[in-house]
Amino acid sequence: MSANATLKPLCPILEQMSRLQSHSNTSIRYIDHAAVLLHGLASLLGLVENGVILFVVGCRMRQTVVTTWVLHLALSDLLASASLPFFTYFLAVGHSWELGTTFCKLHSSIFFLNMFASGFLLSAISLDRCLQVVRPVWAQNHRTVAAAHKVCLVLWALAVLNTVPYFVFRDTISRLDGRIMCYYNVLLLNPGPDRDATCNSRQVALAVSKFLLAFLVPLAIIASSHAAVSLRLQHRGRRRPGRFVRLVAAVVAAFALCWGPYHVFSLLEARAHANPGLRPLVWRGLPFVTSLAFFNSVANPVLYVLTCPDMLRKLRRSLRTVLESVLVDDSELGGAGSSRRRRTSSTARSASPLALCSRPEEPRGPARLLGWLLGSCAASPQTGPLNRALSSTSS
């Protein structure tokens, strides 16, 4: 006989969650199988896509401020994608966390780390573009790849700092039916005399803080940056949005669509401590919106590719390249890869955002396949540094 459910103090919502049972309904089991397949596929796609993006942007492209942002976004998404197989396993074994408390804490922390890092990095990208337009001379003098990396490190540190409470308050809780939850247990540390008040205040604090810091504030920064850029460009008589703008717009839209529902349900969940009537709604919806948030990491690499205009043509061309690269012996490639690496190793100062989709000389073999993923969107910038910084404002 086990009495796991009673070994530690739990919040009322957790106690009642522990009563919920796995379903025996056949149609629901089919949905479970579909969910496992979908998450498995997303895991694979996310790992491959983000791995390729990291390789292409990190090793096959001229390093610019923009590629630095994309590099760190892809790194965040790769981390999230790497944790997705474990979530898939959780689904596959009947919604039970069989991997222990430590891994439960780590797995959940990666999810939240990605959430904060994505929000912070998207804010940085928007502010960066705003500075280029509003303070072009300052941007020209201070916008370096090294500076961008330093900003990213600071943002990662902030993301880690914000993730600490989620690591601390994550726990494994045994359900009455024998399954194990990997979930918040805000009574783990100093529960205090009034359990209900502690549960309510801590859950609300967590939900509101992550909504503000990882969603509302980043979106506010993005929106105000976009407004500032639009106003400035209107004065200059610019109309058509550039390619990098389309990329950022797509990534920001995906971020808002994927994370928005999660934050809504997270806030509802916090209310459900004091309002039990919300619990069934939260229990139904939260798994779906959490998966949607995870899928943001799978969607981003696709967006990097889709926002390049010649994507379909390059896709057709690259399919031939795939076959060539598989069938051609390494010696026949004539060391194209290494010469390409030498050519792109310059750490340019304030390179244009168009550099993410710029067209260097056409690579051969496997490098071309990787090239279509992120490269070859716009003409390579030929102008001087100041002109280049100014021209980037059209993007």
Partner: antibody
Framework: EVQLVQSGAEVKKPGASVKVSCKAS????????IEWVRQAPGQGLEWIGV????????HYNEKFKGRATLTADTSTSTAYLELSSLRSEDTAVYYC???????????????WGQGTLVTVSS | DIQMTQSPSSLSASVGDRVTITCRAS??????FSWLQQKPGKAPKRLIY???TLDSGVPSRFSGSRSGSDYTLTISSLQPEDFATYYC?????????FGQGTKVEIK
């Protein structure tokens, strides 16, 4: 037809233990929870705890933690309540009741056993 | 723990009368609430769950309603077999708690 049939009345001395059984029939025993409730003579109802027969996992009212033990035998579809260190104030009728839950919601005590009178007297 | 305050503790009524019993929860329970009927020497029987849903086999003269944290059991036309003690139960949070009971007696 759902039925919960409990064991007969017991008379115990203070400090002793008592084990009350509750045999379920007419439904899938392992897919429902079994709750235990007691009622002292002329008094109201008091919740003791709940057990999931399929897993053996249980949850107790703090008041009974350490003294009450809930178990279940799936082969005979029987749930048990064992109460130790009996005191005179434990004299009561002990009831078992069935509760259900789904993946997203739960409800409480739709069917009850007939009750078992436990008398604690020296 | 959530306290369930039931009133009245007892009432006398005649057959055909409309009877109302109320229960107040000390904190939000959002309809995780039942009404039980108990006759002398018998086990309790659930009449209503989720605040207002009638159990199968329970006569339609019984009804449950909710207004904020106040829950009401109404017997529209009291029948001889309805003379019993009625308890309310909250099952929103552990430990589940019951009201003190309302004894409905023949006037």
């Amino acid at each position: 037809e759902v039925q919960l049939v409990q064991s007969g009345a017991e008379v115990k001395k203070p400090g002793a233990s008592v084990k009350v059984s509750c045999k379920a029939s007419g439904y899938a025993f392992i897919t429902y929870l079994i709750e235990w409730v007691r009622q002292a003579p002329g008094q109201g109802l008091e919740w003791i705890g709940v057990i999931h027969p399929g897993s053996g996992n249980s949850h107790y009212n703090e008041k009974f933690k350490g003294r009450a033990t809930l178990t279940a035998d799936t082969s005979t579809s029987t749930a048990y309540l064992e109460l130790s260190s009996l005191r005179s104030e434990d004299t009561a009728v002990y009831y078992c009741a069935r509760s259900g839950s789904s993946s997203f919601d739960y409800y409480a005590m739709d069917f009850w056993g007939q009750g078992t009178l436990v008398t604690v007297s020296s | 723990d959530i306290q369930m305050t039931q009133s009245p503790s007892s009432l006398s009524a005649s057959v055909g009368d409309r009877v109302t019993i109320t229960c107040r929860a000390s904190q939000e329970i959002s309809g995780y609430f039942s009404w039980l009927q108990q006759k002398p020497g018998k086990a309790p029987k659930r009449l209503i769950y989720a605040a207002s849903t009638l159990d199968s086999g329970v006569p339609s003269r019984f009804s449950g309603s909710r207004s904020g944290s106040d829950y009401t059991l109404t017997i529209s036309s009291l029948q001889p077999e309805d003379f019993a003690t009625y308890y309310c139960l909250q099952y929103a949070n552990y430990p589940y708690t019951f009201g003190q009971g309302t004894k409905v007696e023949i006037k």
